[in-house]
């Protein structure tokens, strides 16, 4: 632990002014694991002037950083790049004349205290004023800056020409696109100072490339994957003062796939479990030994979990007997195609026979054993049939 500091497994605090520290505290190699440090408290360190790019990076678990009544003048732009857990920063009563929002833009800070610093009135600190105005909490800080006449002005009153928030405008076509197709988004940004523009595509799976000039940009997404349905794409304009973004949600249409269909399991009811993916929402059709299975209060489709374009459910059977043994086929279809899977179900042996499958079971099955198509958003029981409302246009569909 550095001189003038005390260290525990999760905290470092340096408050002794003598002899004091001249650099940000670093732990010796074989001491406490820096990843476990969650709080660093520094006070009364007049000779601590700089936080360098690599000073804080080892403290990846850091949540609270306090440097008060010290000599901090400069913070490197990427000083907190690796400290994504940072929530509270307190730089009260230091020697900061400027501070860029770039230090903090990637952090989800709940508190940034900057009281008592000799900020210079310029566009560089306008973001702090904007941040203050955005906070509706009553405990806003009394921040000041020195103008050209070396006069202290409340930051709340600061007016600087040609220094405002940028704007982003995303000109997106209808962002409903078929799997495998491509799409181009265009975005324009404006502002003074002139903003930079970038795309935030999150964890987009599909291949994408962007062309960006200062105020115009395009994003081309090719061979769009069904996994990207529901994802948000944002165009971001950023300058010294702050950022603006315009976002669209991507909807990908694709043919259904039955990713899971298994033999029945018994719980409160018997259940033939399935998982279906598709967009628009597929209609489900069940067949029993090749014949339409019209749903009833005794046999019906239940969807238990819907995860955007994925549906987990059951063909639920109430008290099935040997008469229900046989082949169950599930067909899922929408206008982009259809998928089909089949399982054999054995619920019960024949009466008077040890619980073994009877190879003759199809002989005694009556046709059209009570599901018609079931829109998988509808899980209510209905007598005899469940109408399908989801297959809107499948011209050109083959299976």
């Amino acid at each position: 632990c550095p001189t003038s500091c005390k260290c525990s497994a999760s905290r470092i605090w340096c408050s002794d002014p003598s002899p004091g520290i001249v650099a940000f505290p670093r732990l010796e190699p074989n001491s406490v694991d820096p990843e476990n440090i969650t709080e660093i408290f520094i006070a009364n360190q007049k000779r601590l002037e700089i936080i360098n790019e690599d000073d804080v990076e080892a403290y990846v678990g850091l949540r609270n950083l306090t440097i008060v009544d010290s000599g901090l003048k400069f913070v490197a732009h990427k000083a907190f790049l690796k400290n994504s857990n940072l929530q509270h920063i307190n730089f009260t009563r230091n020697k900061l004349t400027s501070l860029s929002r770039k230090h903090f833009r990637h952090l989800d800070l709940s508190e940034l205290i900057l009281v008592g610093n000799p900020f210079t009135c310029s566009c560089d600190i306008m973001w702090i004023k904007t941040l203050q105005e955005a906070k509706s909490s009553p405990d806003t800080q009394d921040l000041y800056c020195l103008n050209e006449s070396s006069k202290n002005i409340p930051l709340a009153n600061l007016q600087i020409p040609n220094c405002g928030l940028p704007s982003a405008n995303l000109a997106a076509p209808n962002l409903t696109v078929e799997e495998g197709k491509s799409i181009t988004l265009s975005c324009s940004v404006a502002g003074d100072p002139v903003p930079n523009m970038y795309w935030d595509v999150g964890n987009l799976v599909s291949k994408h490339m962007n062309e960006t000039s200062h105020t115009q940009g395009s994003l081309r997404i090719t061979n769009i994957s069904s996994d990207d349905s529901g994802k948000q794409i944002s165009c971001v304009a950023e300058n010294l003062v702050g950022e603006d973004q315009d976002s669209v949600n991507l909807t990908v249409h694709f043919a259904p796939t039955i990713t899971f269909l298994e033999s029945p399991t018994s719980d409160h009811h018997w259940c033939i479990p399935f998982t279906v993916k598709g967009n628009p929402k597929p209609a489900l059709q069940w067949f029993y030994n090749g014949a339409i299975l019209n749903e009833s209060k005794y046999i019906c489709t239940k969807i238990h979990v819907t995860n955007h374009t994925e549906y987990h459910g059951c063909l639920q059977l109430d008290n099935p007997t040997h008469m229900n043994n046989g082949d169950y086929t599930l067909i899922a279809k929408n206008e982009y195609g259809k998928d089909e899977k089949q399982i054999s179900a054995h619920f019960m042996g024949w009466p008077g026979i040890d619980d073994g499958a009877n190879p003759n079971y199809p002989d005694v099955i009556y046709e059209d054993y009570g599901t018609a198509a079931n829109d998988i958003g509808d899980t209510t029981n209905r007598s005899n049939e469940i109408p399908s409302t989801d297959v809107t246009d499948k011209t050109g569909r083959e299976h």
């Epitope: 209609a283 059709q285 067949f287 090749g290 014949a291 339409i292 019209n294 067909i331 206008e335 998928d339 089909e340 899977k341 089949q342 059209d368 018609a372 198509a373 049939e385 469940i386 109408p387 399908s388 409302t389 297959v391 809107t392 246009d393 499948k394 011209t395 050109g396 569909r397 083959e398 299976h399």
Partner: antibody, heavy 116, light 111 residues
């Protein structure tokens, strides 16, 4: 009980059109494709195409493209197949069949005779 | 279009004896979804066809278990384990994998 009931026999002159109907019952009509198949006297079966009764979307066999029209009236759960510019070799029994890639259900057939 | 070729074209069978019908397609009937849509139909004089077997080997609801289907890819077989009098008729194989759907020539008649 699934049933497909077709309209009665027709006699038409060459160049005329014929419209055969197929009324479905016992299942949700709009949920399943309806196919049309024909069988010339003493011959085999020939697939003509299908209609999706929900959307009205159709797909016709190349041979009948431009000459066949498949439609439906969902309010009465009925599918129609109209064949235009009839020729003598269109004389056949026309069947509606459904409801998926195996033809589990068939209408009783409609005999269309084309003769001058 | 896929051509479906059936053999033999005629099959005299003694009641109670087995019978076998072969069907060959001009290309594979395995669909990209993993299913093979090869179906067998029976037609009796003056009646519409009736589905016996769907997707190679699945017996349709109500079809007696003396009917069975087998095969894969391009070669398929319908077997009747013990022919009964009511089995007399024309048998068609049919593919529903690729449009246009096509049928075997169906000349085969059990006498």
């Amino acid at each position: 009980q699934v049933q497909l009931v077709q309209s009665g026999a027709e006699v038409k002159k060459p160049g005329a059109s014929v419209k055969v109907s197929c009324k479905a019952s016992g299942y949700t009509f709009t949920a399943y494709d309806m196919h049309w198949v024909r069988q010339a006297p003493g011959q085999g079966l020939e697939w003509m195409g299908w209609i999706d009764p929900n959307s009205g979307g159709t797909r016709y066999a190349q041979k009948f493209q431009g000459r066949v029209t498949m439609t439906r009236d969902t309010s009465i759960s009925t599918a129609y197949m109209e064949l235009h510019r009839l020729r003598s070799d269109d004389t056949a029994v026309y069947y509606c069949a459904g409801v998926t890639s195996w033809f589990a259900y068939w209408g009783q057939g409609t005999l269309v005779t084309v003769s001058s | 279009d896929i051509v479906m070729t059936q053999s033999p074209l005629s099959l005299p069978v003694t009641l109670g004896q087995p019978a076998s019908i072969s069907c060959r397609s001009s290309q594979s009937l395995l669909h990209s979804n993993g299913n093979t849509y090869l179906n067998w139909l029976q037609q009796k004089p003056g009646q519409p066809p009736r589905l016996l077997i769907y997707k190679i080997s699945n017996r349709f609801s109500g079809v007696p278990d003396r009917f069975s289907g087998s095969g894969a890819g391009t070669d398929f077989t319908l077997k009747i384990s013990r022919v009964e009098a009511e089995d007399v008729g024309v048998y068609y194989c049919m593919q529903g994998t690729h449009e246009p759907y096509t049928f075997g020539q169906g000349k085969l008649e059990i006498k």
